[in-house]
């Protein structure tokens, strides 16, 4: 089924994260809180009224409002999750559809330069997806993927950002670069 | 009272389609979780496919792909669209209203669906 | 899947019997048992949900025990009209699987 009402959630590679269930709130009539795993329909997580939680795993937790907390994000925890919300009737009362994507955070971006044709690079080692911006005395120059190459011309000594994001990350470097008349190394 | 009236089946050809429909009236449709459950010649009951209260669905793998389940909540009504039919699709289809953990409350009368050339 | 498996197949009872039906499910299901009374021609019918909860309407004879993977359907004084198959139905995951049935007679 194509999922057009997901809430679209990033998590962090590594990190935990929570999956909160908007506009809702605890009540007494409320009697089944179901989390599910759609790719393998599989219930990961529930609260039953005067039952123990039930978790499928120890990476779960299931708070009392509902939230769903899942435990050091593995990339197979990508993934459409499901909540459903029942009254003591059985109604659904709520439901709610989560888009969980995974990245990996990017690393400090690593700039680099030689002064011989005054050509700077700026690299990001790791990270999924990464988005990198160069600065150039605060004025932006280039957008790339992984690496920028720049050759500049306007002076020999320049302040550079780069600045490394993503979804779940942002890192940035800064490097005073200044080179000698003649463009020697 | 909670009522649910199936219609839609017959004899169809293998490798045909059909479209079963569930009317359902006594409760506020829109909310409730919803399945269809057939039961073969040899009396083996079997899920078929559930839609949730939001329009969420599971198919068993037995008939992914070539059944699809949709509700019209402002006609209160569940549709089966079956396709590609075979021979072992042969059964009696119940409309069942369920609760939070696949327990059927209410079911439907069913209707006949003979799957053969 | 998980596996339901019901047991006896058939059984066959005198009026006023207390008959035990039992229901095994291939792991642990904890008590996401659901049971049904299906008599001739006639759909399905809820009798116990969550292994022991009784169900509005169904007769106090009718009581459901156990948890994990052995779940037991007990009716209590056996009357004419209990005549016809019982099922149990495994709720804890989808697809939800059911047992064979246990047809229950009259002498």
């Known amino acids: 089924k194509e999922i057009t009402n997901a809430l679209e959630t990033w998590g962090a590679l590594g990190q935990d994260i929570n999956l909160d269930i908007p506009s809702f709130q605890m009540s007494d009539d409320i009697d089944d809180i179901k989390w599910e795993k759609t790719s393998d329909k599989k219930k990961i997580a529930q609260f039953r009224k005067e039952k123990e939680t039930f978790k499928e795993k120890d990476t779960y937790k299931l708070f009392k409002n509902g939230t769903l907390k899942i435990k050091h994000l593995k990339t197979d925890d990508q993934d459409i999750y499901k909540v459903s919300i029942y009254d003591t009737k059985g109604k659904n009362v709520l439901e709610k559809i989560f888009d969980l994507k995974i990245q990996e955070r990017v690393s400090k971006p690593k700039i680099s330069w030689t002064c011989i044709n005054t050509t700077l690079t700026c690299e990001v080692m790791n990270g999924t997806d990464p988005e990198l911006n160069l600065y150039q005395d605060g004025k932006h120059l280039k957008l790339s993927q992984r690496v920028i190459t720049h050759k500049w011309t306007t002076s020999l000594s320049a302040k550079f950002k780069c600045t490394a994001g993503n979804k779940v990350s942002k890192e940035s470097s800064v490097e005073p670069v200044s080179c000698p008349e003649k463009g020697l190394d | 009272e909670v009522q649910l009236e199936e219609s839609g089946g017959g004899l169809v050809m293998p490798g045909g389609s059909l479209k079963l429909s569930c009317a359902a009236s006594?409760?506020?449709?829109?909310?409730?979780?919803m399945s269809w459950v057939r039961q073969t010649p040899e009396k083996r009951l079997e899920w078929v496919a559930y839609?949730?209260?939001?329009?969420?669905?599971y198919y068993p793998d037995t008939v992914k792909g070539r059944f699809t389940l949709s509700r019209d909540n402002a006609k209160n009504t569940l549709y089966l669209q079956m396709s590609s039919l075979k021979s072992e699709d042969t059964a009696m289809y119940y409309c069942?209203?369920?609760?939070?953990?696949?327990?059927?409350?209410?079911w439907g009368q069913g209707t006949t669906l003979t799957v053969s050339s | 899947d998980i596996v339901m498996t019901q047991s006896p197949a058939t059984l066959s009872v005198t009026p006023g019997d207390r008959v035990f039906l039992s229901c095994r499910a291939s792991?642990?299901?904890?008590?996401?048992l659901h049971w049904y009374q299906q008599k001739s021609h006639e759909s399905p019918r809820l009798l116990i949900k969550?292994?022991?909860q009784s169900i509005s309407g169904i007769p106090s004879r009718f009581s459901g025990s156990g948890s994990g993977s052995d779940f037991t359907l007990s009716i209590n004084s056996v009357e004419p009209e209990d005549v016809g198959v019982y099922l149990c139905?495994?709720?804890?995951?989808?697809?939800?699987?059911f047992g064979g049935g246990t047809k229950l007679e009259i002498k």
């Open positions: 069942a209203r369920q609760g939070a953990n696949w327990e059927l409350v209410y």
């Open positions: 006594g409760f506020a449709f829109s909310s409730y979780d």
């Open positions: 839609i949730s209260g939001g329009g969420f669905t």
């Open positions: 792991q642990s299901i904890s008590d996401f």
């Open positions: 969550y292994a022991s």
């Open positions: 139905q495994n709720g804890h995951n989808f697809p939800p699987t």
